[in-house]
């Protein structure tokens, strides 16, 4: 990595490469998808503290005071007892309990000097200090697990300070010398692993530039860099006296934790924007690490500027390569507060893996100790710390894709922290550890969190082993098992489009003269009606089915066009023939339709106008409106129709009805009590003749508890189940009445004065009309929900379920943020048979956005896996999955980016992807098995090919 | 509180069925799923099926060809049928009521047993 | 079928001790965050009593001397400190394939 430019070595600077490399990568690419697989087998695993933050005693037993003491007292004065913060010193027995707990292989902490050596000098150790450090050492050695020990984290004696100036003093390079020349000799035995400071940029930043950390100082850049300057100097000090005093004997190893942020670029093609990337991450990380890492001095940019201190030559060489691993420090530290971050102009970013990559190509793959990383949650979060577990998912996860993609030589981990603690400027306003402290209490017991029992889970299986219960398989659907394609409300076209043999006139055209064409008089020719392929939009809409290879269409109609008026005093035949036109049209291609009777839509939510206004459906006489519609769609379009959806999504629609929960509830009511009336009309009169069936659909995403560890996140879950998809399906296909949980939390949460909520009661005629109206399961099914307990008081329907979802940022999901949870589907299916009897299931919709407009790789990765758990529950589950629809044909403005074809009818590459799955029905080596019988070949027709 | 209670033979003639009933109390059988499991002092616990809320069943595989379980909601009865025994199915037979949580899959609540001693 | 190994088969401890039971699975019992695996005590004469669910959850009514761990195909059970009344015989289960396997079961004895 180094190149001769004039005969002077300069370090290339090849990190900038990072950003030049990112062209666009597929987002299903297996180096992008949330990676299971385990850690290399030697891996450390790891926990740190900073001596301040834990330790509290900070006038014990003859600690001398420090920098962050005096800060404490004069920059901080709304922090109260702070003195013994979580009080390590003296619940030692308590921290190592913890570390057990854990199953960690190391303990990285620091020692306070002020309490090893009171006034900073080596003149006098602290007999009390030094035995607390010993009885540490000793306990680790015997438990197996390694220490890993920064002789500075921060709290310098305050005599060095007032006495000298602090790290503006390059006599602190010496006096920090002797310290660690006193430990290396007292401890050395028991360290093999040595961090001189601990992220010296905030040493010099925060304390001497914003003023935000000890000393305080603010606004002096000379001083900021000169304290970098002898920060660098006093490590490559200790750090030759190790490699020649004690390595020899000791054979350890030693080190600097560096810290940095990650920065993106605005514009990748922007090179001004790059460089500028470059910049940020050499005015952090560079600005430290190119001494110790790269060639012995400041990154070429910082060098032009008057107040960075010049390395002289010998310098350099001192310098240079005083590292014997890359200690790096990944935290909020160096993301807040965001104001003092070197942005730039620029993006920043927890992007790990990006910024171990950077170091990679910086510094040549040095191995890496990542020695701090974590993040942080807020002071009022006890031991349900959710968001830290899905960050530290999220951040291990690069780490492993760093190594096993990147071949970045990462050999440790050390999770930031162990215990909550003293959190420097924040003070005690954000906790990060992985086990909770009160800080009132006396005994300080520490309590694991969440993000304690998911680290030790980590560790115990060295990473994320693949989760699946079952690999995916080979196998195929039924032969009669119905591949298709669902279509929202389908819009008519009220007059022909495209209008053949209507016309009773011969013209002549004039070809070679004004090319008009003419009228011959008195002369009349047979007319014939329009007729099904005079519609340009269902030639156009048969051509996408056709191309897809679907077997089976689903598409609502529009109960607005065909009953204006609502009633059956005004019918529009014309729609209603279009309709009949496009289930026709299909079923010559072997198309078969499922038609949604009423398909709710945001805008007037699919009512006609006179129905809306009079209360939609908090007014029953629409339920008798609705009877009335679907007599007249069983009767006009049933001899062709076999499967029918009475109401789309009813457990969705009733959240429209909103103005209070009570509102949504009746509406829900109303909606079933409708369903019914339709399902046994058609039951009656229609089903012993036309011998289809009858159902509704159900929006039915999974849900799982974003907190495992968390027994309130498990009901949540169950809870969402029951609010979301036993409110109806309960009544309708089991019990005639709503789930008893549902009914038992509303009544509970109305007791305690949390809800005004009343489930209406089914009366028992009602109850005996909606128990068993359903021939199939109907489901739609997109995500899967990672749900919270929150306790929720405001007066709707949704705040009944104390329900709230988590993103899970570790999780592939679509631009409108639906997670990627195939197994989900299969869970669901499984769910509905135990739950419901066991009936033929079609899952009427399942798709997601996907903003590309050819190559739709998230729709084709979707629809592959979807379709596998689908198939799983089919062949182990014993699922009766009879049909599965995948979302959706065309895009729509209220659905963007969800469909197979684009606005102007282009296919996008899932449609192709889709018609393979289709014709091997499933996943096999060869085609549709032979069993099943391919469609007849087209018969060539002598006539079409004469006039063609 | 919750009950389960069974009733059948405690003997069995070889090549015969087994007929037990199971009744239970204070809890619903289209919200609790109910199962089966034996104990025989040579082959300790083992799980023989359930039939779930829904009605569906599944049963263990190495008995699926002379298991049948049944309900009737309206009763709060399930029943257990084996055919063909033999000397060696001689064993208490349970029913028990599941957890009744989509993500907890246990047995909470058990009969108090059905001994049954197939013999000549 | 998932095979459940119980160890020790028999285990005598002294009063106030802890008591610590071991249960191996021949595949993991882990599936999408959750662990199928579940605990029971079993008096004579008497049938199973349910302890723990999903590995280290406690069934209401069971007192906290009991608690459970472990993922994938290692979980323990543990009793601490031991009472005259744990006198029992203890079985694993696991419930992530079917058929539901029990473990051979550990006699815990007084000492």
């Known amino acids: 990595d180094y190149k001769d430019d004039d005969d002077k070595l300069e370090f290339s600077g090849d990190g900038k490469a990072i950003w030049d490399k990112k062209q666009y990568v597929s987002p299903v690419n297996p180096g992008q998808l949330f990676l299971y697989d385990t850690f290399p087998k030697n891996f450390s695993w790891g926990v740190g503290t900073g001596a301040f933050q834990v330790e509290g005693s900070w006038k014990a037993d003859g600690r001398g005071p420090s920098i962050w003491d005096r800060y404490v007292d004069s920059h901080l004065r709304g922090v109260n007892s702070t003195d013994r913060s979580t009080d390590s010193y003296v619940f030692l027995e308590k921290d190592l309990l913890a570390l057990d707990f854990l199953g960690v292989s190391f303990y990285q902490f620091s020692i306070s000097w002020p309490r090893l050596f009171p006034n900073g000098t080596v003149a006098a150790v602290n007999a009390k200090g030094l035995q607390y450090y010993r009885a540490l050492l000793d306990s680790l050695v015997l438990r197996n697990i390694e220490p890993i020990v920064t002789l500075y984290h921060w709290d310098l004696p305050l005599t060095l300070q007032e006495e000298y100036g602090g790290w503006k003093n390059a006599t602190m390079i010496d006096l920090f010398n002797d310290y660690a020349t006193y430990c290396f000799q007292t401890f050395g035995d028991r360290v093999k692993y040595w961090i001189t400071i601990h992220n010296p940029y905030l040493v010099a930043w925060h304390g001497f530039g914003t003023g935000m950390h000890a000393p305080g100082e603010k606004g002096n850049l000379t001083a900021v860099y000169t304290v970098g300057h002898n920060l660098i100097k006093a490590h490559s000090k200790v750090w030759h006296n190790y490699d020649k005093n004690f390595r020899p004997h000791q054979k350890g190893w030693l080190s600097i934790t560096l810290g940095s942020h990650w920065i993106e670029p605005n514009r990748t093609e922007n090179m001004e924007d790059v460089i500028n990337c470059q910049h940020s991450m050499s005015s952090v990380l560079g600005w430290f690490a190119n001494p110790i890492h790269g060639d012995g001095d400041y990154p070429e940019f910082m060098k032009t500027s008057s107040v960075i201190p010049e390395f002289s030559e010998a310098e350099k060489e001192e310098v240079r390569g005083t590292a014997d691993f890359f200690a790096f420090s990944f935290g909020p530290n160096n993301f807040r507060p965001s104001n003092t971050v070197v942005k730039m102009g620029q993006n920043v970013s927890l992007n790990l893996r990006q910024v171990l990559n950077w170091i990679k190509l910086e510094y040549d793959n040095p191995r890496i100790l990542i020695s701090e990383n974590g993040w942080f949650t807020d002071s009022y979060i006890k031991t349900e710390d959710t968001t830290a577990i899905y960050m530290m998912k999220n951040f291990l996860n690069q780490v492993l894709q760093a190594i096993k993609f990147d071949e970045i030589q990462v050999f440790g981990y050390t999770a930031w922290t162990l215990l909550d603690g003293f959190e420097w400027q924040d003070a005690y306003t954000t906790r990060r550890g992985l086990f909770y402290v009160d800080f009132n209490s006396e005994q300080k017991e520490r309590k694991p969190k969440s993000s304690a029992h998911y680290y030790k889970q980590i560790i115990q299986d060295n990473g994320f082993p693949l989760q699946e219960s079952t690999p995916d398989m080979k196998g195929q659907f039924p032969c009669d098992f119905s591949w298709g394609v669902t279509e929202s409300v389908l819009k008519p076209e009220f007059t022909v489009s495209s209008p053949q043999f209507t016309d009773p006139h011969l013209y002549v055209w004039n070809v070679t003269g004004n090319r008009l064409l003419y009228r011959v008089e008195g002369v009349r020719l047979k007319t014939r009606p329009s007729q099904c392929t005079d519609y340009v939009s269902i030639k156009k809409r048969v051509e996408m089915l056709a191309k897809m290879k679907v077997t089976h269409y689903q598409f609502a109609l529009d109960w607005t066009s065909i009953l204006p008026t609502g009633n059956l005093s005004k019918i529009n035949r014309q729609v209603l023939r279009y309709y009949r036109c496009v289930v026709s049209e299909g079923l010559k291609l072997g198309i078969s339709p499922m038609v949604t009777l009423y398909h709710p839509t945001h805008s007037h939510l699919g009512l006609p106008m006179p129905l809306l206004s009079s209360g939609g459906w908090l007014n029953t006489n629409t339920a008798k409106a609705f009877q009335d519609y679907a007599g007249l769609c069983f009767k006009e379009l049933g001899d062709l129709v076999k499967l029918w959806i009475t109401i789309n999504e009813p457990n969705r629609l009733s959240d429209m009805y909103n103005r209070t929960s009570n509102d949504t509830y009746r509406a829900a009511h109303n909606l079933m009590i409708a369903h019914a009336q339709v399902w046994h009309l058609y039951d009656r009169q229609y089903r012993p003749v036309q011998h289809g069936a009858v159902s509704l659909s159900l929006h039915s995403d999974w849900a799982e508890p974003a907190n495992p560890y968390v027994e309130s996140h498990w009901k949540a879950a169950e809870r969402f189940l029951q609010f979301e998809i036993a409110w109806f399906a309960d009544p309708l296909f089991k019990t005639g009445d709503y789930p008893l949980a549902m009914k038992e939390y509303i009544a509970s949460k109305k007791q305690r004065g949390l809800s005004s909520s009343v489930l209406p009661r089914f009366t028992l005629k009602e109850s005996r009309l909606v128990k068993g109206t359903i021939d199939f399961y109907a489901l739609n099914h997109f995500t899967t929900r990672f749900v919270i307990h929150k306790q929720l008081n405001t007066n709707c329907s949704v705040a009944d379920r104390d329900v709230q979802f988590l993103q899970d940022i570790t999780r592939l999901s679509s631009p409108s943020r639906l997670a990627v949870t195939p197994w989900g589907m299969r869970k669901l299916l499984g769910w509905i048979r135990r739950n419901y009897r066991d009936m033929d299931i079609y899952v009427t919709a399942n798709g997601i956005d996907d903003l590309a407009l050819e190559d739709d790789q998230i729709r084709k990765y979707y629809l592959e896996k979807y379709v596998q758990e689908a198939l799983k529950a089919y062949l182990i589950d014993k699922v009766k999955i009879k049909g599965y629809y995948a979302f959706k044909l065309t895009e729509e403005k209220s659905k963007p980016r969800f469909g197979f074809f684009t606005s102007d009818f282009k296919a996008k590459s899932s449609v192709q992807f889709y018609s393979k799955l289709i014709s091997s029905s499933g996943f096999s080596s060869e085609n549709r098995s032979p069993a099943c019988g391919q469609p007849p070949e087209d018969t060539e027709c002598a006539i079409c090919s004469f006039l063609t | 509180q919750v009950q389960l209670k069974q009733s059948g033979p405690g003997l069995v003639q070889p090549s015969q069925s087994l007929s037990v009933a199971c009744t239970v109390s204070d809890f619903s059988l289209t919200t609790y799923g109910v199962h089966w499991v034996r104990q025989s002092p040579g082959k300790g616990l083992e799980w023989l099926g359930v039939?779930?809320?829904?009605?569906?069943?599944d049963y263990n595989a190495a008995f699926i060809s002379r298991l049948t379980i049944s309900k009737d909601n309206s009763k709060s009865q399930v029943f257990f049928k084996m055919n063909s025994l033999q000397t060696t199915d001689t064993a208490i037979y349970y029913c028990?009521?599941?957890?009744?949580?989509?993500?907890?899959?246990?047995?909470?609540?058990w009969g108090q047993g059905t001994s049954v001693t197939v013999s000549s | 079928d998932i095979v459940l190994t119980q160890s020790p088969t028999s285990l005598a401890v002294s009063l106030g001790q802890r008591a610590t039971i071991s249960c191996r699975a021949s595949?993991?019992?882990?599936?999408?965050?959750?662990?199928?695996m579940t605990w029971y005590q079993q008096k004579p004469g008497q049938p199973p009593k349910l302890l723990i669910y999903?590995?280290?959850n406690l069934q209401s009514g069971i007192p906290a001397r009991f608690s459970g761990s472990g993922s994938r195909t290692d979980f323990t059970l543990t009793i601490d400190p031991v009472e005259a009344d744990d006198v029992a015989t203890y079985y694993c289960?696991?419930?992530?394939?079917?058929?539901?396997?029990f473990g051979g079961g550990t006699k815990v004895e007084i000492k």
């Open positions: 999903r590995a280290a």
């Open positions: 028990a009521r599941d957890y009744g949580s989509t993500y907890v899959d246990a047995i909470d609540y």
């Open positions: 289960q696991q419930s992530n394939e079917d058929p539901w396997t």
């Open positions: 595949e993991s019992v882990e599936s999408y965050g959750n662990r199928y």
């Open positions: 039939i779930w809320s829904g009605g569906s069943t």
